[in-house]
């Protein structure tokens, strides 16, 4: 008598998540009498997937009528496939008995599930950095299968090359995650810049997913300070200007000191934006020269975005009062990022 064969024609089947998977199985003979069962996996840990005789398998339906006389097709359809359904499925013939005895197994069909990656999430550094510094951006996407995936980084449309990407886990899995870290060198012009992480996968039909991050969240552009004196007014009042330019973010506090004593403190708010996304701010201080016997040392002190204060000092000469004082007569500088003013 011809030996019974259990034929699983497909070595592997690939299905998109949410779709149905058909697992084919035919037997070469009607004898011996006994049921067919479907298992995922082999050995003692295998899971029963379908047993016509008993059990409740709501997502599994036979492709042909298993109760029909002379039926030799025991293919099944599994609906609403998820990545957790991946594995090797075996069609197994049993000989009728008490209990039924396993007779022969098919060679197995490996079911792989194609699952889309989640929308990439890009996160930037926890603290801001200044121009010429390198900051790291991380892009993460999860839940995709198969493992093959392409990730690219762009800054303002230009592809970046300094990045490192890992796909986990390293071995076979029902689904995978990707994590990539890109290193970006900041420039003062990057307030309006954007980094984009682009993920391409077979499930996306050539339409990659993108995640973005604004460099405005990562950059600090420190201000330039300039202190100047306008011409002395007829009432012996000197108008001293502190120009704070090209800074980002807007969070800034300016303090005027007269001979080391706080004269006035101002907070920047609702400033107009420059084309490059930075801000400018100008503060004025009127000094009554006739109220002072000695020279007045004025200091414009700027605290930007929680950083150490930057000072610019300026001395107003009181000893001689020329009627027109169109230019600075003397200046002192302390602190960082300072220039002499003459």
């Amino acid at each position: 008598e011809e030996e019974l064969q259990v034929i699983q024609p497909e070595k592997s089947v690939s299905v998109a998540a949410g779709d149905s998977a058909t697992l084919n199985c035919t037997v070469s003979s009607l004898i011996p009498v006994g049921p067919i069962q479907w298992f995922r996996g082999a050995g003692p840990g295998r899971e029963l997937i379908y047993n016509l005789k008993e059990g409740h398998f709501p997502r599994v339906t036979p492709v042909s009528d298993p109760t029909k006389r002379n039926n030799m097709d025991f293919s099944i359809r599994i609906s609403n496939i998820t990545p957790a359904d991946a594995g090797t499925y075996y069609c197994v013939k049993f000989r009728k008995g008490s209990p039924d005895v396993e007779l022969k197994s098919g060679a197995g069909t490996e079911l792989s599930v194609r699952a889309k990656p989640s929308a990439p999430v890009v996160s930037g550094p926890a603290v801001r950095a200044t121009a010429e510094h390198t900051v790291s951006f991380t892009c993460e996407s999860h839940g995709f299968s198969p493992r093959d995936i392409t990730l690219k980084w762009f800054k303002n449309g230009n592809e970046l090359s300094d990045f490192q990407t890992n796909v986990d886990p390293a071995g076979k899995s029902v689904s995978y995650s990707i994590r990539s870290t890109a290193r970006v060198v900041l420039t003062r012009r990057d307030v309006h810049s954007q980094v984009i992480c682009e993920v391409a996968h077979v499930t996306l039909q050539g339409d990659p997913l993108r995640g973005t991050a604004n460099l405005s969240e990562a950059i600090r552009v420190p201000p330039f300070l300039e202190v100047t004196q306008q011409s002395m007014r007829a009432d012996n009042q000197v108008n001293v200007t502190c120009q704070v330019t090209k800074f980002y973010p807007q969070r800034l506090q300016l303090t005027w000191l007269e001979n080391g004593n706080v004269s006035r403190t101002e907070m920047a708010s609702a400033l107009p934006e420059n084309k490059d996304g930075t801000y400018n701010w100008t503060s004025w201080l009127l000094v009554n020269v006739s109220a002072h016997r000695d020279d007045v040392k004025l200091t414009c002190q700027v605290e930007h975005d929680g950083q150490p204060a930057v000072n610019k000092s300026f001395s107003v000469k009181v000893s001689a009062h020329p009627k027109e004082q169109g230019s600075n007569t003397a200046a002192e500088n302390t602190g960082t990022n300072e220039r002499n003013i003459y």
């Epitope: 050995g43 003692p44 295998r46 899971e47 075996y90 396993e102 022969k104 197994s105 197995g108």
Partner: antibody, heavy 122, light 112 residues
């Protein structure tokens, strides 16, 4: 080429818990059983238990009450925990891969770690 | 549990000569699907065991053809057609039909 590497403390105090990890490199955890086997000094091999990639565990009945095997697919690792150890648990502990291709049984323990010596002593 | 019994305990051999090891199980390892769930392993001195034969008679990848497995049900034999010096070590049979998996006590093969 699949390789297995056991790691864990070489000395465990009596009544404490023995914890070992096996790292799988160069291959997949899927579709295999992952086994722990031990060999007391100068003696034969004793099967402790195994875990299938789907998380189902099987233990030697003589050790079942003290043993837990777990699997971390994301790290490509599986672990053994054995509680209330005594000097009789002193052995070389091997982790190994067991094949299963069809049917109810197993098709050979084809990859073994190099083994790690665990001594139970105070 | 299935009990595995190996004989002899020790086997002195001459290089180039054949050798044979017996393994008996307390119940049949022949399953209804036609497979005998019995493996043979060799543990060389200071090394981990290595798989030689699986499912009773199938040679594992990379195993020389001088090793062969035979038998069915409860009686199994491992034959080495021509012993070589590298074959010294302890040979174990193991049943893989049901848990707990159980090993024979081992047969120590040494050169005369």
């Amino acid at each position: 080429q699949v390789q297995l590497q056991e790691s864990g403390p070489g000395l465990v105090r009596p009544s404490e818990t023995l914890s070992l990890t096996c790292t799988v490199s160069g291959g997949s955890i899927r579709n295999y059983y992952w086994s722990w086997i031990r060999q007391p000094p100068g003696k034969g091999l004793e099967w402790i238990g195994f875990i299938y990639y789907n998380g189902r565990t099987f233990y030697n009945s003589s050790l079942k009450s003290r043993v837990t095997i777990s699997l971390d697919m994301s790290m490509n690792q599986f672990s053994l925990k054995m509680t209330s150890v005594t000097a009789a648990d002193t052995a070389v502990y091997y982790c190994a891969r067991v094949r299963a291709y069809s049917g109810i049984g197993l098709d050979g323990t084809d990859v073994w770690g190099q083994g790690t010596t665990v001594t139970v002593s105070s | 549990d299935i009990v595995m019994t190996q004989s002899p305990l020790s086997l002195p051999v001459t290089p180039g000569e054949p050798a044979s090891i017996s393994c008996k199980s307390s119940q049949s390892l022949l399953y209804s699907n036609g497979y005998n769930y019995l493996d043979w392993y060799l543990q060389r001195p200071g090394q981990s065991p290595q798989l030689l034969i699986y499912l009773g008679s199938n040679r594992a990848s990379g195993v020389p053809d001088r090793f062969s497995g035979s038998g069915s049900g409860t009686d199994f034999t491992l034959k080495i057609s021509r012993v070589e010096a590298e074959d010294v070590g302890v040979f174990y049979c193991m049943q893989a039909l049901q848990t707990p998996l159980t090993f024979g006590g081992g047969t120590k093969v040494e050169i005369k």
